[in-house]
């Protein structure tokens, strides 16, 4: 019998590299059975995950999986960091693994990129 628990399919140590000034959609794949849970995004600040309020979010349905999307319109340098989605299901909170957004600022010709940026 298939489990009807809510599952959040963000892979451990997943990351995204994107330019500041580019659009980006951060997706949280959500599996549920009957009723879609309430899902939120938060950004890690040390050990605390701060809930993101007033941000553009949306749902996308694909076959047997739904995606809760956090829209970056566009990505800002300050968006660099780790994010987590969490679902409220039957009064329980299910948390995803964190996913990291590496924001690269477009360089001017006189600036040199860091080794991390060149490799990321």
């Amino acid at each position: 019998k298939e489990s009807c628990d809510v599952q959040l399919y963000i892979k451990r140590q997943s990351y995204h590299s994107i330019f500041a000034g580019d659009p980006f959609k951060l997706e949280c794949p959500v599996k549920y059975c009957a009723h879609r849970p309430q899902v939120t995004w938060c950004k890690l600040n040390g050990t605390t995950c701060v809930k993101l309020e007033g941000r553009h979010t949306s749902w996308k349905q694909e076959k047997n999986l739904s995606f809760f999307i956090l829209h970056f319109e566009p990505v800002l340098p300050s968006d660099n960091g780790s994010y987590r989605c969490s679902a409220n299901f039957l009064s329980a909170i299910i948390e995803s693994h964190s996913t990291t957004l590496y924001v690269t600022d477009v360089k001017s010709a006189s600036e040199r990129p860091s080794k991390d940026e060149m490799a990321s």
Epitope: H16, S17, I18, F19, A20, G21, D22, P23, F24, E73, P74, T104, V106, K107, S108, A109, S110, E111, R112, P113, E117, M118, A119, S120
Partner: antibody, heavy 115, light 114 residues
């Protein structure tokens, strides 16, 4: 509706100038990286340059010194000023939102450089 | 200067076939590569960015892989609507802060139905 619309194309003589516009609707163009890409008739895509969200412009060597990308935030528009035009600049010119994740493109405007 | 070499320049395949296109950079561009689809008379459409990230709304039959200098774009099961020209583009210039004397786009691959 979120879209980009290019305009200003047309027929111009070699050595002449033309200013293309890229008008944005549904989003604030000043917050985004915007690139210009062109395509000569029957040929592949060719990068012209881009302006980043901070307002710094970057150009391909073939455009450097002849082309200038600028932005008018009050009109939510971007411009490509093209001077000293050559016959090889004949192409459809596109503007696109984003540099790596270029999710939105205009329909293009045709520039013909001919005597 | 980074040069992008795309191959083949054209290919013919049957509906349902697996189609593979390659793009080679003349020097390492990490994963800063995008793939586009363009149909006649239309603007390019982003399919893949950062070498392997599927753009929003793009069917899962499209995929990309690779890093450094060698990249691959795959259509797992060719559909009639996939008839188009496909282009790779290096966006590494945004990282290193220089523009190339060469075009960061590959030469394109025209995909036709057999």
């Amino acid at each position: 509706e979120v879209q980009l619309v290019e305009s200003g194309g047309g027929l111009v003589q070699p050595g002449g100038s033309l200013r293309l516009s890229c008008a944005a609707s549904g989003f604030d163009i000043s917050k985004y990286n915007i690139q210009w890409v062109r395509q000569a008739p029957g040929k592949g895509l060719e990068w012209v340059g881009f302006i980043n969200y901070g307002g710094s412009a970057y150009y391909a060597s073939r455009a450097k010194g002849r082309f200038t990308i600028s932005r008018d935030d009050s009109k939510n528009s971007l411009y490509l000023q093209m001077n000293s035009l050559k016959t090889e600049d004949t192409a459809v010119y596109y503007c696109a939102r984003g540099l790596s994740n270029s999710d939105l493109w205009g329909q293009g405007t045709l520039v013909t450089v001919s005597s | 200067d980074i040069q992008m070499t795309q191959s083949p320049s054209s290919l013919s395949a049957s509906v349902g076939d697996r189609v593979t296109i390659t793009c080679q950079a003349s020097q390492s561009i990490s994963s800063w590569l995008s793939w586009y689809q363009q149909k006649p008379g239309k603007a390019p459409k982003l399919l893949i960015y950062r070498a392997s990230t599927l753009a929003s709304g793009v069917p899962s039959r499209f995929s990309g892989s690779g890093s450094g200098t060698d990249f691959t774009f795959t259509i797992s099961s060719l559909q009639p609507e996939d008839i188009a020209t496909y282009y790779c583009q290096s966006t590494y210039g945004g990282v290193v802060g220089s523009t190339s004397d060469d075009n960061p786009f590959g030469g394109g691959t025209k995909v036709e139905i057999k």
